[in-house]
Interface confidence: medium
């Protein structure tokens, strides 16, 4: 073993390195002193360290750590990030699509239902969005709501329009006749299924993402404690006390700090990974009636079909809800049923479909590939920042703790450092109680990313079949019946062009097949129907 | 292009009516709201109400207690707003202007109130 | 009613100089959808007034760079990056959230 180079008398090198942690001079020894008040970077004779110094070098030290950690997290951390926000963005702009699809189905199809159905889609697809971002709204609530309120307007705007206004108190009859007599048949029924169903999947997916942000920066922001800091210090900072500036770490010994270190995160890594492994399960299934782009971008074709079908049964319909609601309204009025054809706007509309572009799928999927390099991420934290650390290549000529060596020995090393403290007992003191909360949150989304894993085969829950759809209905699979049907049927297919779309607002004066342009952005907000938190202003 | 092009100017007695109309074209008159705005000479601007034409919904400034109504003509696209007791400090110009934004602007009715 | 207030009432400006102009709301002006109505005009004198910045801070086709619009919740600005002969007029920040829409003031820019 090399013989130390002889003290530095003056403790010059030590001052001028340690001035770059702390400007001044009052806490170097002008000469190196015996060092009996040190606690960490214990001295085997003169040393150019004070107590002081030890503290600083302490602080320093665990800075240091916390700044490689971030460092260490912040490639996985933005990809979690953008891609939370990029879906996030993404999903709102498939339910505004949905909602503008649907409302330019009404506009095209059936003009005299609106302005009140733009307003009753409206609320649905605002729900739809709150939903989503983790409000706690009901689904098949949502979904009766839509149709609860379109029924009244659908009965006395197409199949009753000789009604009067004074008949008007008959809506809340309506609505429960549209429940009790199923006037939109299975419908209903159907789209609560595909929108619970999808929606749920995007709502954990987006959850999931969330809470691998929380994970990143619970862990991104760790304090690390005095016995870590005392270990980093001896590790990076004793050395200078000896003078000895330019001395690197012993690789192996650096591993052993660092996983003594990192005892309480590297707990996190088996949730990690089941994380990762579940949510890929998750983005496996999130096709058909579990992907909501496919489910909300359909939706319009679904209302469309409903109408038909009560259009279909108007003549019996008209007559039962005479009888039943016939002490809602002065006399009879005559049923005004006209022929399916003439509320079919036969214009088709086309929205672009391009084959190859990027999809949310496609981009789900990249994500979860991309996190999977990442699988290993906790497991792997203490090698990777000794690799991104000074260490000595190798482990030759290097420090360990107490001295220069020619070669790093850990059980040396560990027999050395005896009377300053235990690295296994570090280990055993458990994680963090900020760790302990973030491994329980892991824990609740793989459980609930577990109970979301998609069933294999066919997707629906038999008993639609059983509510007694009409051929025609619906077709075979109500998996697929979401599809557009009718000439006047926007033609949508399940590619939202994910990038592209996300600088593009499209309205329903921007509807497919409309001309209007609207400026600027005009599709934001009404003063009678979207005022948020204001009472309506509607006379 | 999008015009909205407004009746000519008014003298009125207190305790009068006047109406004042708002012609559209350029865009499909129905599917915007039309609001109304004055300013009272050397004074800043005032939001009376709106209409949408589609609807007919409508929607006023509490300020006015009633004394103002909007309404539409579809078939000729053209709004009105109808403000009734006039009194002196009801002088000002009344503006149309198209929701939302109000990226569009009639050139201004000037509506005097005087004995 | 939602009190728009703006600061300064007047503003007098050297040809070339940069301008700013403030506007306060007595209420927070952002949607449940996440946008702030927020606009900005400007009345010429003698016009009607028109539109230069909507939803805090995208300026209106054929609006001039130089203008620039920024804030959120209840504080906005806008600035004129360096003032014109043809930019005096009377600067006004409207709110259209809630019922009844309320406009500031207004801000009389002239030039020194």
């Known amino acids: 073993q090399p013989p130390p180079p002889p003290p530095d008398a003056t403790c010059h090198q030590v001052r001028s390195f340690f001035q770059r942690l702390q400007p001044g001079l009052k806490w170097v020894p002008e000469t190196p002193v015996p060092g009996s008040d040190l606690q960490v970077c214990l001295p085997k004779g003169p040393t150019c360290c004070s107590r002081k110094m030890e503290e600083k070098y302490q602080l320093t030290a665990r800075l240091n750590m916390e700044q490689l950690l971030q460092s260490a997290s912040m490639e996985l951390k933005f990809l979690i990030i953008q891609n939370a926000a990029v879906f996030q963005e993404a999903f709102e702009i498939v339910v505004r699509h949905a909602k503008n699809y649907t409302n330019a189905m009404f506009k095209n199809n059936y003009p005299s239902l609106t302005p009140q159905a733009f307003e009753f889609v409206g609320e649905f697809f605002t729900d739809v969005s709150l939903y989503i971002l983790g409000s706690d709204i009901n689904v098949d609530d949502m979904v009766n709501e839509l149709f609860d309120s379109l029924f009244p307007v659908i009965y006395t705007q197409l199949m009753n329009p000789g009604l009067p206004d004074s008949a008007l108190d008959i809506n809340e009859c309506l609505r429960g006749a549209r429940r009790d007599l199923k006037v939109f048949g299975n419908f209903p029924k159907l789209i609560m299924t595909q929108v619970s169903k999808s929606l749920q999947v995007t709502r954990i997916f987006l959850q999931a993402l969330n809470l691998g942000i929380e994970v990143i920066n619970t862990t991104d922001h760790l304090k690390f404690s005095k016995d870590c800091g005392r270990m980093l210090t001896r590790m990076w900072y004793c050395s200078y006390c000896q003078g000895l500036m330019m001395v690197k770490p012993c690789g192996g010994y650096c591993n052993v700090v660092m996983q003594g270190c990192m005892a309480g995160v590297v707990e996190i890594d088996k949730y990690w990974r089941e994380y990762i492994l579940s949510l890929e399960e998750l983005v496996n299934g999130m096709y058909r009636i579990y992907d909501m782009e496919n489910v909300l971008l359909g939706l319009f074709s679904t209302i469309h079909d409903s109408i038909q079908y009560v259009q279909k049964n108007a003549g019996k319909l008209t007559t039962t809800i005479g009888k039943l609601c016939a002490h809602s309204q002065q006399r009879q009025y005559r049923s005004a049923y006209y022929p399916e054809d003439l509320f079919i706007d036969k214009k088709v509309l086309k929205v672009a479909h391009v084959e190859h572009e990027e999809t949310l799928s496609s981009r789900r999927r990249e994500l979860i590939q991309k996190l999977k390099s990442f699988i290993s991420f906790y497991s792997a934290l203490p090698g990777y920042i000794c690799s991104h650390s000074p260490v000595a290549e190798n482990d030759t000529l290097c420090w360990n703790g107490q001295e220069l060596v020619e070669r790093y020995s850990q059980k040396a090393a560990r027999n050395g450092m005896k009377n300053q403290f235990n690295l296994h007992e570090l280990k055993m003191k458990g994680p963090e109680p900020v760790v302990s909360q973030i491994i329980d949150k892991l824990k609740h989304i793989n459980q609930l990313l577990r109970t979301m894993s998609m069933p294999k085969g066919r997707v629906l829950d038999k008993n639609l079949d059983e509510e007694g759809f009409e051929s025609g209905d619906c077709g075979d699979d109500e998996d697929e019946c979401i599809g557009g049907s009718g000439d006047g049927m926007i033609k949508v297919k399940n590619q939202l062009r994910f990038l592209a779309e996300l600088a593009y607002d499209l309205d329903v004066d921007d509807a497919p097949g409309n001309s209007q342009q609207a400026t600027p952005k005009d599709n934001e907000i009404s003063t009678f129907h979207n005022l948020g938190n204001v009472h309506s202003p509607l006379k | 292009e999008v015009q909205l092009v407004q009746s000519g100017a008014e003298v009125k007695k207190p305790g009068a009516s006047v109406k004042v109309s708002c012609k559209a074209s350029g865009y499909t008159f129905s599917d915007y709201e039309m609001h109304w705005v004055r300013q009272a000479p050397g004074q800043g601007l005032e939001w009376m109400g709106a209409?949408?034409?589609?609807?007919?919904?409508?929607a006023y400034n509490q300020r006015f207690k009633g004394r103002v109504t909007i309404t539409a003509d579809k078939s000729t696209s053209t709004a009105y707003m109808e403000l009734s007791s006039l009194r002196s400090e009801d002088t000002a110009v009344y503006y149309c202007?198209?929701?939302?934004?109000?990226?569009?602007w009639g050139q201004g009715t000037l509506v005097t109130v005087s004995a | 009613d939602i009190v728009m207030t703006q600061t300064p009432l007047s503003l007098p400006v050297t040809p070339g100089e940069p301008a700013s102009i403030s506007c306060r709301s007595s209420q927070s002006l952002v949607h449940s959808n996440g946008n702030t109505y927020l606009q900005w005009y400007l009345q010429k004198p003698g016009q009607s007034p028109q539109l230069l910045i909507y939803?805090?801070?995208n300026r209106f086709s054929g609006v001039p760079d130089r203008f620039s619009g920024s804030g959120s919740g209840t504080d906005f600005t806008l600035k004129i990056s360096r003032v014109e002969a043809e930019d005096v007029g009377v600067y006004y920040c409207?709110?259209?959230?809630?019922?009844?829409?309320?406009f500031g003031q207004g801000t009389k820019l002239e030039i020194k």
């Open positions: 409207s709110q259209s959230i809630y019922v009844p829409y309320t």
């Open positions: 939803k805090v801070s």
């Open positions: 209409i949408h034409p589609g609807s007919g919904d409508t």
């Open positions: 202007a198209r929701f939302y934004s109000y990226a569009y």
